[in-house]
């Protein structure tokens, strides 16, 4: 009788075991026999693992209605964080190997980094395992000796081999017992791993005429594995081809004397064991998938699948999957994996160039003809920095535009004693009729009375200061500094721009009669005005500083 549940397929065998053990204890038991806790790297492998668990569950007499968990070889080491961007979420297979695309998580994973975490298969032990419903993966603490973790019932091991032998063919009554390298005995393997021993006991079993034969699964030629036996075993003239088709793989031909021979269908040939048939062209059945090319093995035996460049064989060795070249960080900055290839990209602010494949170099956004800035532009690594000349502030959603500062409505209060005119990047002062602009370009002095428009400055006009001028501009935040050579009493921050080519006009004459000091006058009802801080208010009127923009409109911008 079989001592454990075992399933062999492809180039691996899976065993399932009961035992309330920690993940580390389970891994040690697998390791002792040359294996690891099982991988589940594809749906095909998930089916093999499900089959071995179904075998195990069938042997258990009375299973209660409960959820049970079986360790597999997926773990995340202490200090490695959950990574939601990967199919395995930062977990890796204990035997090593690549990050595989297949996963079957039961639910949202717990977000952690500190603790080691282990994965088990979640089974409803009261239900039969249906082929379409593969066991879900459950993540949790890895347990410790004597404290395996909640609902842990057992574990699944995987043993990998260089190849498999077909089961021995019996042409008459008998019993074959296979002993595998991982110390499991079984009579019902669909594939038998390399280095397994087979004990064949021929006969009905209750008679003394039973004979025993021993065979070893050997590698006869590269990738060719067989038992070294010739012809069906336990043959008896009594049965001929009637027992198990004579043990033949395909056709059985009887001779008249009770002897028989195995044969093959067209397109197949009989192998050296005189039992098994193999395709004359092993690739004729198109075993390779996903763009893989089939390469026949030597002597028309076996085959290998080969993938195009940029792809690699998956765990089944039959299908091609894309190689993620980006794992090797071939690019200086950004790597985009594409089917069969990859491409390098540069971050915003960089462009392809420089030494080496996939290199990136800084884009000089400030270079001639490409500056995004309205005024000043400073290139930085991977970016740029816009700045504005004095009298302007950065504006626009992206901070590349420059907007004129309306000094006449600035936070520092009135800049001019009387009239203030905003200009692009600066401002200038003016006076009411009967007053003239003082040499400081800010104050108004009593002049000859006239009913003309407000007066501009005297001939020697002052311009508002700019960067690089002989008079440094004052900081906007401290409204104490007047034009050089004047007492610091005028509430201005920068010297005004005084320009004769922009005459001061459009102030209604009927409201321009001087009244008291030059900074005090009745508010024209049609003007938007800005209140002057600290000014005295004449009887019957509001005190204000009129503002007028260069475009001829009145008031605040």
């Amino acid at each position: 009788a079989d001592t454990e549940a075992v399933v062999c397929a492809g180039t691996a065998c899976y065993t399932a075991h009961w035992g309330k053990l920690s993940a580390a204890e389970a891994q040690n038991l697998c390791l002792q026999n040359g294996g690891n806790l099982a991988t589940v790297k594809s749906e095909e492998e998930a089916q093999h693992v499900q089959q071995v668990l179904a075998q195990l569950l069938r042997r258990e007499a009375a299973l209660t209605a409960r959820m049970g968990k079986f360790w597999i070889g997926l773990q995340r080491e202490k200090g490695k964080c959950l990574d939601p961007s990967l199919p395995l979420k930062g977990f890796s297979w204990v035997g090593g190997g690549e990050d595989t695309p297949y996963s079957n998580w039961h639910k949202e994973l717990r977000n952690s980094c500190i603790s080691k975490r282990c994965v088990s298969l979640l089974l409803d032990l009261s239900q039969p395992l249906l082929p379409g419903r593969l066991p879900k993966w459950s993540e949790g603490p890895c347990g410790s000796p004597g404290s395996p973790g909640s609902n842990i019932e057992g574990f699944v091991c995987k043993f990998s081999f260089k190849g498999m032998c077909r089961p021995l063919a019996l042409g008459g009554p008998g019993q074959v017992t296979y002993t595998t390298p991982f110390q499991t005995t079984s009579s019902s393997l669909e594939a038998v791993p390399f280095a397994s021993a087979a004990n064949v006991a021929c006969g009905e079993g209750d008679k003394d005429d039973s004979q025993s034969h021993y065979f070893l699964c050997k590698e006869k030629a590269p990738d060719v594995f067989d038992w070294g036996s010739s012809g069906p075993l336990c043959v008896s003239p009594k049965y001929g081809c009637n027992f198990n088709n004579g043990g033949c793989h395909q056709d059985c031909f009887e001779g008249g004397d009770g002897s028989f021979l195995c044969g093959c269908r067209p397109g197949f040939r009989l192998l050296d064991d005189l039992v098994t048939c193999a395709s004359r062209n092993p690739c004729s059945s198109s075993p390779c998938r996903g763009g893989a090319t089939c390469i026949p093995g030597p002597h028309g035996k076996n085959y290998t699948c080969r993938c195009p460049q940029g792809y690699q064989l998956d765990s089944s060795q039959l299908d091609c999957v894309d190689v993620d070249e980006c794992q090797d960080s071939p690019c200086a900055q950004e790597c985009v994996n594409t089917p069969g290839s990859f491409r390098c990209e540069c971050w915003v602010g960089y462009e392809p160039g420089g030494p080496g494949e996939g290199a990136c170099q800084d884009v000089d956004e400030c270079a001639l003809g490409r500056s995004p800035c309205a005024q000043g532009c400073t290139n930085t690594e991977g970016s740029f920095h816009c700045s504005c000349e004095e009298g302007y502030v950065l504006a626009g959603e992206d901070g590349t535009q420059c907007q004129d500062v309306d000094e006449c409505v600035g936070p520092g209060g009135p800049l001019c004693d009387s009239l203030c005119f905003n200009t692009q990047g600066s401002f200038r002062c003016g006076c009411l009729p009967g007053w003239v602009l003082a040499p400081n370009g800010v104050s108004c002095a009593m002049g000859p009375v006239s009913l003309g428009p407000p007066s501009g400055p005297p001939d020697e006009e002052y311009k508002g200061e700019r960067e690089g001028s002989t008079v440094p501009p004052a900081a906007t935040a401290s409204p104490t500094r007047g034009p050089e050579g004047t007492p610091k009493s005028t509430p201005t921050t920068r010297r005004p721009l005084l320009s004769s080519d922009a005459p001061i006009t459009s102030v209604p004459l009927e409201v321009l009669a001087p009244s008291g000091s030059p900074g005090l006058w009745r508010e024209p009802s049609i003007h938007h005005t800005t209140a002057a801080s600290g000014a005295q208010e004449p009887a019957g009127g509001d005190s204000s500083v009129a503002t007028q923009n260069d475009d001829g409109t009145d008031g605040q911008k």
Epitope: L82, D83, N111, S112, C113, I114, S115
Partner: antibody, heavy 120, light 108 residues
């Protein structure tokens, strides 16, 4: 919403120990790790270590040479950080913090901080 | 341990300016594990950007980040008065987690 409320300011003598608490609310306490970060006056941030309340596993910054112990009490949803053999260099504000539903150790939630002064 | 060096250590900029802070690591850091925090005086740090370029919940879009390997950048596209604070980068690529030395941002 997630809240981390820390114990009050402490004044300790050199050589003494301090135990700072951090009470969590607004989530299942065992779902998120708890970490501790300190900041000396006028200095930057220094990670001290963290604890996984589900398992009790810890990770410590070796700079603290075995002087630090982090524990949790799941019944009260409280994390503790004990620092022993205090010197004046341990004068700092101590923060508990965790990364909630964010990944990769991006610390999304912080306690208000506990000021610890070590002075003779 | 990985050392994070921030530059500049302090900077003064005007409202509306574009501000850039650089964080260099002594060895390569996965972009998923590089984050940026803002800390105002007397307050706990606040997460602004996680995994190099993702905005934390409720953080204004004027904040952004980029980078990979050993060089990461944090940008404020248009500086606001309320952005006055110290900014820290933080990485994890095995214990210990480390923070950058900090960049103190002031308004001109």
């Amino acid at each position: 919403q997630v809240q981390l409320v820390q114990s009050g300011a402490e004044v300790k003598k050199p050589g003494a120990s301090v135990k700072v608490s951090c009470k969590a609310s607004g989530y299942t306490f065992t779902d998120y790790e708890m970490h501790w970060v300190r900041q000396a006056p006028g200095q930057g941030l220094e990670w001290m270590g963290g604890i996984d309340p589900e398992t009790g596993d810890t990770a410590y910054n070796q700079n603290f040479k075995g002087r630090v112990t982090m524990t949790t009490d799941t019944s009260t949803s409280t994390a503790y950080m004990e620092l022993r053999s205090l010197t004046s260099d341990d004068t700092a504000v101590y923060y508990c913090t965790n990364y909630g539903n964010l990944y990769y150790y991006a610390m999304d939630y912080w306690g208000q901080g506990t000021s610890v002064t070590v002075s003779s | 341990e990985i050392v994070l060096t921030q530059s500049p250590s302090s900077l003064s900029a005007s409202v509306g300016d574009r501000v850039t802070i650089t964080c260099r690591a002594s060895s390569s850091v996965s972009s998923s594990y590089l984050h940026w925090y803002q800390q105002k005086p007397g307050k706990a740090p606040k997460l602004l950007i996680y995994s190099t370029s993702n905005l934390a919940f409720g953080v204004p879009s004027r904040f952004s980040g980029s980078g990979s390997g050993t060089s990461y950048t944090f940008t404020i596209s248009s500086l606001q008065p309320e952005d006055i604070a110290t900014y820290y980068c933080q990485q994890y690529s095995g214990y210990p987690l480390t923070f950058g030395s900090g960049t103190k941002l002031e308004i001109k």
